[in-house]
């Protein structure tokens, strides 16, 4: 049994880091493998993660952490029974993938303005809380070409757009994702999408 693709890990910079790797053949990850992880700290102890299958030869493990600070470094040991298959390390602050925003809501009752709001996925005491910026994706269910991205570079989790920038009388969907420049993170996953029917009063045509 050998590791074909070494584990790569990303952290949500809160409580979970996710490591993925591939074996050289079909593997029952949960019964055959264990990933041991330990914070490099005098008084820490090793924790065991039981991996799950992620495709035939792929494995994924969700490492639980109390919290994360920039100095944290973890040692990782991948075991198959008594055999050490791979040894490495992981610094969560250097591999951050933020949590996805939640509770995306489209408020259509403001006069001819669409207000999209969502929730910051971090509690106020987390460092990323004040460092997230967002991308909002809006697309038409009827027209695949009607697909747009709005970059929200301010901290407030909201976006206002004129309803008239979208076509009237058709349904749209929106979703939002986050990233943090400070840690050069990857983008989060997209939030679940939300759907609304876009309708607004056409202005009187002037002749």
């Amino acid at each position: 049994m050998k590791v074909l693709q070494e584990p790569t890990c990303v952290s949500d910079y809160m409580s979970i880091s996710t490591c993925e790797w591939k074996m050289n053949g079909p593997t029952n990850c949960s019964t055959e493998l264990r990933l041991l992880y330990q914070l490099v700290f005098l008084l820490s102890e090793a924790h065991t993660c039981i991996p799950e299958n992620n495709g035939g030869a792929g494995c994924v493990c969700h490492l639980l952490m109390d919290d994360v600070v920039s100095a944290d470094n973890y040692t990782l040991d991948l075991w198959a029974g008594q055999q050490l298959l791979w040894k490495g390390s992981f610094k969560p602050s250097e591999h951050v993938k933020p949590r996805a925003p939640g509770n995306l809501t489209v408020h259509t009752n403001v006069s001819d303005t669409l207000l999209l709001t969502w929730s910051n996925p971090y509690p106020p005491d987390n460092y990323l809380y004040n460092h997230l910026t967002y991308a909002v994706n809006i697309w038409s269910e009827n027209d695949p070409a009607d697909f747009r991205i709005y970059n929200v570079t301010y901290l407030e989790p909201s976006l206002r757009i004129a309803a008239s920038t979208l076509k009237s009388g058709i349904s749209y969907r929106a979703r939002v994702r986050a990233w943090a420049q400070c840690y050069n993170t990857t983008w989060s996953e997209w939030s679940p999408s939300t759907k609304w029917h876009n309708s607004y009063r056409e202005p009187f045509e002037q002749h």
Partner: antibody, heavy 116, light 111 residues
């Protein structure tokens, strides 16, 4: 609410023994390393000993090595410090502290006086 | 004598910014991060800063920490009378498997 309550302090003669206890509540005791820190009257803080969450690894300051023993009972949420061969210079307030990278919660301390 | 050196005293007037230094000796290992504790008169110490610059919840943002090599600093801005206390720096010494604490700095708020 995290609470640490030390007990067992008192007056003891040089060469004597004392056992301090620290009762923990308000958090999952078995998931945290713990430590003892002391403060002699009018002096600064001095780290004494620390123990990992399972008790697998234990560390002592040179000044108490061979005389003091730290231990824990996770089923009772209690930390202990067995102090033998006590000396006058061990006189101090002994604080129990929870460890999360640093000493993030402290008890109110118990006074140990070593005097003849 | 402590491996971490702090000035024995510091002072400032209300509203001022004061800084307390904590210096590791030249041979001190540059590995662990620094922590700061506040001890108000007659009370148990309290964690103020951990991992060089992180504040536990409930600690005002007037308190900030920084690290440079084997030295660290605690800054207190907008000084208040209730900040009058002893301040200690500490770090894990991985070379000797121990926790070391500075000698403490007594902060006096004047006026």
């Amino acid at each position: 609410e995290v609470q640490l309550l030390e007990s067992g302090g008192g007056l003891v003669q040089p060469g004597g023994s004392l056992r301090l206890s620290c009762a923990a509540s308000g958090f999952t005791f078995s998931r945290h390393a713990m430590a003892w820190v002391r403060q002699a009257p009018g002096k600064g803080l001095e780290w004494v000993s620390a123990i990992t969450m399972s008790g697998r690894s234990i560390y002592y300051a040179d000044s108490v090595k061979g005389r003091f023993t730290i231990s824990r009972d996770n089923s009772k949420n209690t930390l202990y410090l067995q102090m033998n061969s006590l000396r006058a210079e061990d006189t101090a307030v002994y604080y129990c502290a929870r460890v999360h990278r640093a000493f993030d919660y402290w008890g109110q301390g118990t006074l140990v006086t070593v005097s003849s | 004598q402590s491996v971490l050196t702090q000035p024995p005293s510091a002072s400032g007037t209300p509203g001022q910014r004061v800084t307390i230094s904590c210096s590791g000796s030249p041979l001190f290992p540059d590995s662990g991060s620094f922590n700061w504790y506040q001890q108000l008169p007659g009370t148990a110490p309290k964690l103020l800063i951990y991992a060089d610059s992180h504040r536990p919840s409930g600690v005002p943002d007037r308190f900030s920490g920084s690290k440079s090599g084997t030295s660290a600093s605690l800054a207190i801005s907008g000084l208040r009378s209730e900040d009058e206390a002893d301040y200690y720096c500490g770090t894990w010494d991985y070379s000797l498997n121990r926790y070391v604490l500075g000698g403490g700095t007594k902060l006096t708020v004047l006026g």
